[in-house]
């Protein structure tokens, strides 16, 4: 073989006379005196098998040269590239009437690959070939030679193969190279879809629609299609494929993400480095595993760092005020890498004798602003029992606390409530009003906080505005206030006392004494 010759990727060579080892051995007619196989030397001193004829002396030349059978390989249109040298008749004195400067190209389709003779009538003419000005200068044996290149195409072809023939009509010519090829759109990958080798259509204007298949580790986004043009070029790519999760595009392929990288979705994005506190140990990771002690919340994206529960709140301070407690604390030293930190308060009521025997405080205790999901670092707890041991736990929580709850995430304080004064009296009533007296009655406070020792009634004339008031004390829950002025408005307040002291006065009760005796039941509103 004369050496490997490189042709465009979109051309498939069916015959290349330059690549044939030894003699070409094509069939000539007549057998002698017409086309002759001659070896010439190229610039590398390598023999080139050529066919030459130079019968310029006699008129009416009809010298035929036929190639061997050429398989079609499914091509419907083939191209014939002829490189030849044609001698100018002017350089051959005395032959002007008989010398020609053209030759004819023919073809014959056949399923028979062993036809031995040339039957001229079977052949169809492709074209008359003439030397034009588009020759190239080629070194042949140190001689600069004008090498013409002509390309013709023929189709549509339908039989298994065909023969080419060259008819000389009296030229001085050398066929230096005959190459027969068809065009294909070569296997290619576009938008991660692979399109197979596709032979071009029968017409020079035809487009062949080809559906692509997604490359390994990818999936269709839109159906990938392209058109194979007659010149062997792919046209109009439509649709595309995307690399699967765990894979990224590299040089038209979907490569698995490297260890330490991941890709969560089928997108055109590249693999990303595992987020902080996570890792992947296999290639092709779709997510990264959290390090020991680190977690992802359900709504955390795969791209977010793995986080952990917060450490315990710091600097918990309690302030007991009788049966209320105010708690304050500082944020944890370690928030676990999250912003969604909040605090929960756990209240436990513990026995005085055995602090380990604690039970939940129940629903009677109130928390301001709330017990759970606190965003602030303070809470006020009220309505506790007096003289009771309470343990309060402040839990720092975030989005991953539920995966690893631990006492390390809380801080606690134990307090004892003081003896508290009774609560205020809710309802004071005027049972009987006369010109000079008012009979009052009331209910025990909601929270006596101990044994009520007595009640204190404070009253004054409304016009005096508490500048001058009188006090009456009683152990009972009623009393008669005497010595009042007739037809005068009085304001009454009642409070209870225990060992811890007085509670708050009740809301004011306004009563006006009569001009004539009468019985009126007060409801806490003004009585006239």
């Amino acid at each position: 073989v004369t050496g490997s010759r490189v042709y465009p990727a979109n051309e498939v060579t069916l015959l290349d006379s330059r690549s044939v080892q030894g003699e070409l051995g094509w069939i000539a007619s007549p057998l002698e005196g017409g086309w002759e196989e001659v070896s010439i030397m190229d610039e590398k001193n390598t023999p080139i098998r050529t066919y030459q004829v130079c019968n310029v002396m006699e008129a009416s030349q009809n010298n035929w040269l036929r190639t061997d059978w050429i398989t079609r390989e499914g091509a419907q249109r083939v191209y014939i590239e002829i490189k030849f040298t044609l001698r100018d008749c002017n350089s051959l004195p005395g032959v002007m009437g008989t010398c020609k400067e053209t030759f004819n190209l023919y073809y014959y389709e056949s399923d028979n690959d062993k036809e031995r003779f040339i039957r001229e009538s079977q052949f169809g003419k492709i074209d008359t070939i003439a030397a034009d000005e588009s020759f190239t200068q080629v070194d042949i044996g140190d001689r600069i030679m004008k090498l013409n290149t002509e390309i013709r195409d023929v189709g549509p072809l339908s039989k298994k193969g065909f023969y080419l023939a060259f008819q000389d009509v009296g030229a001085c010519i050398a066929l230096v190279s005959v190459r027969v090829f068809y065009k294909k759109c070569p296997l290619t990958v576009r938008n991660l879809a692979q399109f197979p080798d596709t032979i071009t259509g029968a017409d020079t204007s035809s487009l062949v629609e080809v559906r692509g298949s997604c490359v390994n580790n990818s999936e269709e986004k839109d159906v990938p299609k392209m058109y194979c043009g007659a010149d062997g070029e792919w046209l109009v790519p439509i649709g595309n494929c995307l690399c699967n999760a765990g894979h990224e595009e590299q040089n038209g392929e979907c490569q698995a993400c490297k260890i330490g990288y991941y890709k969560a979705l089928s997108t055109d994005a590249s693999c990303a480095k595992c987020p902080p506190h996570s890792y992947s140990v296999w290639e092709g990771a779709t997510s990264c595993t959290c390090d020991r002690g680190f977690f992802r919340a359900d709504n955390d994206a795969a791209s977010m760092p793995c986080t952990r529960p917060p450490s315990a709140p710091l600097n918990l301070i309690s302030n007991v005020n009788e049966t209320s407690v105010n708690l304050e604390w500082s944020s944890p030293q370690n928030t676990g890498g999250r912003q969604d930190i909040s605090y929960n308060v756990v209240c436990k009521k513990c026995g005085a004798g055995d602090p380990s025997k604690c039970r939940p405080c129940g629903s009677g205790v109130h928390y301001t602003p709330q017990q759970n999901g606190l965003k602030t670092t303070r809470v006020s707890i009220t309505d506790l029992l007096a003289h009771t041991n309470y343990t309060f736990e402040i839990w720092a929580v975030n989005g991953v606390s539920k995966y690893n709850p631990s006492p390390d995430q809380s801080v606690s304080v134990t307090v004892t409530t003081n003896q508290a004064a009774p609560s205020s009296i809710a309802l004071v009533q005027a049972k009987e009003v006369t010109r000079y007296s008012v009979a009052l009655a009331w209910l025990e406070p909601d929270r006596p906080n101990g044994v009520i020792l007595e009640y204190e009634v404070k009253y004054y004339e409304k016009d005096q505005n508490e500048r001058s008031y009188r006090i009456v004390r009683t152990a009972a829950r009623n009393t008669d206030i005497k010595g009042l002025n007739p037809l005068t408005s009085y304001v009454f307040h009642v409070r209870a006392r225990t060992a811890a002291g007085y509670g708050d006065f009740s809301e004011p009760l306004e009563v006006t004494t009569n001009t004539v005796p009468s019985r009126i039941i007060g409801d806490g509103a003004n009585s006239t």
Epitope: G33, Q52, C54, N55, M57, E58, S91, G141, M145
Partner: antibody
Amino acid sequence: QVQLLQSGAEVKKPGASVKVPCKASGYTFTSRAMSWVRQAPGQGLEWMGWINTNTGNPTYAQGFTGRFVFSLDTSVSTAYLQISSLKAEDTAVYYCARVRFTVYGDGMDVWGQGTLVTVSS
Amino acid sequence: EIVLTQSPATLSVSPGERATLSCRASQSVSSNPAWYQQKPGQAPRLLIYGASTRATGIPDRFSASGSGTDFTLTISRVEPEDFAVYYCQQYGPSWTFGQGTKVEIK
């Protein structure tokens, strides 16, 4: 096989004429031009010219016009060289040679055995 | 008219040696000359013609090269039957021969 057959030696007096035949065989006579070459004793080759065997049209080299005539008889596939008014300096071996035209260059691929023409008084 | 000058006039070589014969044209020519071999008492024999093509039956120890005005015939390993006179010949509208180079036994 392809052959060119020339006649034997000729001895001529100055001023005389000679006609040297060259009979071709083994190929189509009219398909190839015929060339004539002179070689004086101890000298090199001199191309005299050639004749188109198809048309009979001759081409003469410089110095070989006038007294030298190329002719043909295609019926017997023979070419002739006729020299008139012979001179002593015409003494030489005269060769006929078949011309090979090719696209890359020409040459004389088949030669007759030569005819020695001696011009002597 | 193109004049061909051959050198050397005589080349002495031993059998098996390489022989290089030169042919120089008086002006640049577009093609290689033909080369002929002539032995005493024999007609010339065509060795090489257009594009350095060897004539039928010529062994491959004969090769020709060159371009422009300088051309060379090379006998790679001279055999005893190669001792002869060699002529170059330029073709065209007018053909001319060089004066010849004699290759003799050293």
